[in-house]
Interface confidence: medium
Amino acid sequence: PGPPPGPPRVSPDPRAELDSTVLLTRSLLADTRQLAAQLRDKFPADGDHNLDSLPTLAMSAGALGALQLPGVLTRLRADLLSYLRHVQWLRRAGGSSLKTLEPELGTLQARLDRLLRRLQLLMSRLALPQPPPDPPAPPLAPPSSAWGGIRAAHAILGGLHLTLDWAVRGLLLLKTRL
């Protein structure tokens, strides 16, 4: 009478789940660091580079004490979605100079996408409230020049590196609180 019941569902160990997310984040941090170094070697940065469309920094030493898992994962996911969009834009509109960063930029995009899916899975496995679907973001204007694309690349990779760096620290801290 119907198929036999499947094996009992084992609820995942949240620390192990978080561990694998930390590993992915660390791996992406290393990739981003290497790509940012490659960019600096090919196109040395003169001073700091900003892009208004990038997310503002979400973490610092002072914020660590009040960190909570739902807030961190939701914010991290939102910020990484923004960076994914910026990396896609960079590959599409960044100009011929940035083609020299391929295939690494494509690999970075794929790994960023993988981390985002991992965060989504982690949130559902931990039964955290799912954030509402993201409203469509306004399209990013193409860089005004080849140099504009390079400056944008410095800003995007620098911001992503900093975001991932804090993400690793925050996730490690949260793991100890589970």
Partner: antibody, heavy 117, light 110 residues
Amino acid sequence: EVQLLESGGGLVQPGGSLRLSCAASGFTFSHYDMNWVRQAPGKGLEWVGVISYDGSNKFYADFVKGRFTISRDNSKNTLYLQMNSLRAEDTAVYYCARTPGSHFDYWGQGTLVTVSS
Amino acid sequence: QSVLTQPPSASGTPGQRVTISCSGSSSNIGNNAVNWYQQLPGTAPKLLIYYDDLLPSGVPDRFSGSKSGTSASLAISGLRSEDEADYYCSAWDDSLNGVVFGGGTKLTVL
């Protein structure tokens, strides 16, 4: 290129005060937490304290609490360390260091503070 | 007395592999990332390893880090004379609410 340049060190008497500065360039200063770390002559590294990127939070080592104050001026890309009630054991090279997460990825060259009568 | 414990000295001959240990507790190494710094004579410290085993740009892959429980170690393979320096481990300490360092290990290349 990221650069951190400390200044303001010198000779001061016990009980005196001194203000160190750290001028930052080559990166978006307002995005990074900043630290002070010191090293007494012939000794190891000792963390002094950290200030968050927007200046809203500060943490200090126990040995400086109430005597030292870290501040920053993001419009001037400058980090400060105000040192009061100085003691002989505060004699050290003081370094400023940038923190992107849990580590210090760039350090200044250091400025020597000598506390002696 | 440093919160993290390192051997005061270590030595090796060119080409050899040396390791430097760093032991702590659950409030620092056990729960937080370990970082390693190299300080060449007369210079400021330089980041060598972060998040236990990641290498910053420009650091040769002869350097590697590892962590297990409340201990960490730095390994240097293919030792060179320019590796002669002081090496420090570091981690955030949850109890002290601050960064702690090891006492430093002076590496001599014989």
